[in-house]
């Protein structure tokens, strides 16, 4: 039966995808055939075939970026070291080990789901402008994050969430495969408005909040909250 595992990694980091037999196992590298593939498209990530050093079957996206340790394989550790993780690496990987002395029977099958994350930049909230006499518009921008973010606007006076119908979010996938987000908030003009923009990265359980005020010159400091304690309201509402 195939074992199933999950692992998380930051964009640009290196990660180990675990695939190992119980401790104390010994393997002959002239006997085992080891394959790492992506589970869906069956893209070849790397492999070991006895007496064959060529890796011509490896997909160009993984060439020189995915390695197994020969010393590890001898003791039954067929884990994959994946270097410089990219957003495109967020998928399921399948490790398969066959023994030729057992008639090419599978001796190990492991599926590892890789979740990829990247921190969003601290949001930048533009100074409010007035498209009309009775309306204020704020723009919040944050870039280079992963996965796709959630954006919330907060009334900083009581830390309540503003109605999401008031905001218009545009999320772009940039050249690096990371997400950029621009959120435009339109609210009724009042004498003094104290609002905040919150960018939530669900995978990292991280929220970045920046405030903006009208009616005075005091700017709210940027805040980052990780692994918050839930308050019963929507998580992003009270990260300050």
């Amino acid at each position: 039966d195939t074992q199933e595992k999950e692992v998380r990694a930051m964009v640009g980091s290196d990660v180990e995808l675990s695939c190992a037999c119980p401790e104390g196992s010994r393997f002959d590298l002239n006997d085992v055939y080891v394959y790492w593939q992506t589970s869906e498209s069956k893209t070849v990530v790397t492999y070991h075939i006895p007496q064959n050093s060529s890796l011509e079957n490896v997909d160009s996206r993984y060439r020189n970026r995915a390695l197994m340790s020969p010393a590890g394989m001898l003791r039954g550790d067929f884990s994959l070291r994946l270097f410089n993780v990219t957003p495109q690496d967020e998928q399921k990987f399948h490790c398969l080990v066959l023994s030729q002395s057992l008639g090419f029977q599978e001796v190990l099958s492991v599926e590892v789901t890789l979740h990829v994350a990247a921190n969003f930049s601290v949001p930048v909230v533009s100074a409010p402008h007035s498209p009309s006499q009775d309306e204020l518009t704020f723009t919040c921008t944050s870039i280079n994050g992963y996965p796709r973010p959630n954006v919330y606007w907060i009334n900083k006076t009581d830390n309540s969430l503003l109605d999401q119908a008031l905001q218009n979010d545009t999320v772009f996938l940039n050249m690096r495969g990371l997400y950029d987000v621009v959120s435009v908030l339109r609210i009724a003009r009042t004498p003094s408005v104290n609002i905040g923009c919150c960018i939530e990265n669900v995978l990292l359980q991280q929220n970045l909040t920046v405030g903006s005020q009208t009616g005075n010159d005091i700017g709210e400091r940027d805040k980052i909250t990780e692994n918050p304690v839930s308050t019963g309201e929507k998580n992003a509402a009270t990260w300050s």
Epitope: Y35, S41, K42, V44, Y47, P50, N57, H94, L96, Q105
Partner: antibody, heavy 121, light 107 residues
Framework: EVQLVESGGGLVQPGGSLRLSCVGS????????MSWVRQAPGKGLEWVAY????????YYVDSVKGRFTISRDNAKNSLYLQMNSLRAEDTAVYYC??????????????WGQGILVTVSS | DIQMTQSPSSLSASVGDRVTITCRAS??????LAWYQQKPEKAPKSLIY???SLQSGVPSRFSGSGSGTDFTLTISSLQPEDFATYYC?????????FGQGTKVEIK
């Protein structure tokens, strides 16, 4: 233990259709290329059709192109061969085979026991 | 497709004889060659893979050699149960193609 069990063979009239099925067990079916190989009475082995792991690539011997369709259902560990417009020369034992994982050489073919298809009026 | 040419197409031999069958590929296939034995009404049985590796459970009187385009299957001392048809198959690339077979008969 690796097992491949074919079904769906039998006697069919020329111009008729038949659908062969093969169920694999004892291995991770979705990780391997699979194929159908046939052997006419008293003749040698002839590959008929190949299919990649995810079904995205298929290859057919010239003599069956346009008449036979290979497909697979990885959720059911099953391989299929839909045979239409059958001819007398398609009479053969049809073997389901587990092939390799890579495009270029890796592991040898593993064979099912075969099933007889007879095309005759 | 890679063409596989086997010779001879048939041979007669006696128990105890040394038998050699050759297989030639139309282009280089490194050592990605398998040999199969087939008896009437049976599926092919794997004997040799990667040109020279003996499948587990196969008697040591069977051996394979060769690389590139020319390959040989040798039965060092023919036994009564060895009378069968032998096929080579390249698995360097798809489609995996076969030789036409060599029938080993009793003299």
């Amino acid at each position: 233990e690796v097992q491949l069990v074919e079904s769906g063979g039998g006697l069919v009239q020329p111009g008729g259709s038949l659908r062969l099925s093969c169920v694999g067990s004892g291995f991770t079916f979705s990780s391997y290329w699979m194929s159908w190989v046939r052997q006419a009475p008293g003749k040698g082995l002839e590959w008929v059709a190949y299919i990649k792991q995810d079904g995205s690539e298929k290859y057919y011997v010239d003599s069956v192109k346009g008449r036979f369709t290979i497909s697979r259902d990885n959720a059911k560990n099953s391989l299929y061969l839909q045979m239409n417009s059958l001819r007398a020369e398609d009479t053969a034992v049809y073997y389901c085979a587990r092939d390799g994982i890579l495009w270029f050489g890796d592991i040898p073919t593993y064979w099912g026991q075969g099933i007889l298809v007879t095309v005759s009026s | 497709d890679i063409q596989m040419t086997q010779s001879p197409s048939s041979l007669s031999a006696s128990v105890g004889d040394r038998v050699t069958i050759t297989c030639r590929a139309s282009q280089g296939i490194s050592n990605w060659l398998a040999w199969y034995q087939q008896k009437p009404e049976k599926a092919p049985k794997s004997l040799i893979y990667t040109a020279s590796s003996l499948q587990s459970g196969v008697p040591s009187r069977f051996s394979g050699s060769g690389s590139g385009t020319d390959f040989t299957l040798t039965i060092s001392s023919l036994q009564p149960e060895d009378f069968a048809t032998y096929y080579c198959q390249q698995y360097n690339s798809y489609p995996r193609t076969f030789g036409q077979g060599t029938k080993v008969e009793i003299k």
